[in-house]
């Protein structure tokens, strides 16, 4: 179950309810735990996790990545710009999280939990954002054809793609977590 106002919170009235920032922080950490579990299965199943950074860098995927201009790093930090980047990035990751849904045998539920928790996280962050107009939503048609293309790859490429998505999503969330703690 994704984190939120769980039964422990309800049963202890003296405990302060989570602030918006705390809820977001908790949500990201929950998703990161899920990614760790999925990475464990991927690494046990194939030797993709030993792949060199060079090989992984030479990919055709356009996975969201934090850059200096996004204002999420300590130098040149910009709360507004950064929040837009985090939300936009998470929206772009959604198609890749959909791709992951049929990629796990023993961690099927975990993959679904990561996907659903990310949707909840996006909603939390959209409530926090002031400039929602600056957030571009990916085109559904483009996403549908991308998904078809990813699913058509040979098994080796699908294993590599799965590994790279998990690694990139983990890095993106870790950067987001650091940035959000400064807001």
């Amino acid at each position: 179950v994704p984190p939120g106002e769980d039964s422990k919170d309800v049963a202890a009235p003296h405990r302060q309810p989570l602030t918006s920032s705390e809820r977001i922080d908790k949500q990201i950490r929950y998703i990161l735990d899920g990614i760790s579990a999925l990475r464990k299965e991927t690494c046990n199943k194939s030797n993709m996790c030993e792949s060199s950074k060079e090989a992984l860098a030479e990919n055709n995927l356009n996975l969201p990545k934090m850059a200096e201009k996004d204002g999420c790093f300590q130098s040149g930090f910009n709360e507004e710009t950064c929040l837009v980047k985090i939300i936009t990035g998470l929206l772009e990751f959604e198609v890749y999280l959909e791709y992951l849904q049929n990629r796990f045998e023993s961690s099927e539920e975990q993959a679904r939990a990561v996907q659903m928790s990310t949707k909840v996280l996006i909603q939390f962050l959209q409530k926090k954002a002031k400039n929602l107009d600056a957030i571009t939503t990916p085109d559904p048609t483009t996403n549908a054809s991308l998904l078809t293309k990813l699913q058509a790859q040979n098994q080796w490429l699908q294993d590599m793609t799965t590994h790279l998505i998990l690694r990139s999503f983990k890095e993106f969330l870790q950067s987001s977590l650091r940035a959000l703690r400064q807001m």
Epitope: S51, N60, K149, N154, W156, M160
Partner: antibody
Framework: QVQLQQPGAELVKPGASVKLSCKAS????????MHWVKQRPGQGLEWIGE????????NYNERFKSKATLTVDKSSSTAYIQLSSLTSDDSAVYYC???????????WGQGTTLTVSS | DIVLTQSPASLAVSLGQRATISCRAS??????????VNWFQQKPGQPPKLLIY???NQGSGVPARFSGSGSGTDFSLNIHPMEEDDTAMYFC?????????FGGGTKLEIK
Amino acid sequence: QVQLQQPGAELVKPGASVKLSCKASGYIFTSYWMHWVKQRPGQGLEWIGEINPSNGRTNYNERFKSKATLTVDKSSSTAYIQLSSLTSDDSAVYYCSRSDTKATCDYWGQGTTLTVSS
Amino acid sequence: DIVLTQSPASLAVSLGQRATISCRASESVGNFGISFVNWFQQKPGQPPKLLIYAASNQGSGVPARFSGSGSGTDFSLNIHPMEEDDTAMYFCQQSKEVPYTFGGGTKLEIK
């Protein structure tokens, strides 16, 4: 050594169905995908589909989705292709071939010549 | 589907000379630093035989006179020096994504 054994020929009447076999030996059957390829006389090669013997997962060429069904019998290390509603266009040599996860077909059967004729 | 265009359709080469067959893909067949192009040789009445995989790697037991090169969308198979036994049909194939597709084939003969 790796071997993929296929019957040499099959003669079938139009409208009928046929199930062609490919018996694998000399390697762990469930560790490699099995592919099926069609070749009409004097023509090129056409990929029909592949099956993962470990879990039965299949991928088909859209052109053959309503024509071919791929299955495996793990106990006898045999792959099958069932072809339905046969017409003269289905007369061809059908090859089975094993591949690694990169879909590189390194070993091939000798092929089964299917003749559809009344 | 990825379309592979092979050229020439037929080729006659003198013994000891070089034979070059080209294969062009309708889109990139590479990812993660690997080009998913394979080359096969087929003689009459026989199944195809793997010569080259992943664009430039020799199949097991394949003579050194067969070599492959290329990346992205353009690939080639080189045979040098040409021998009598090399008379056959040659096919390129992409194994990047389903449906895995083959080129139309090149008929190689001795001049």
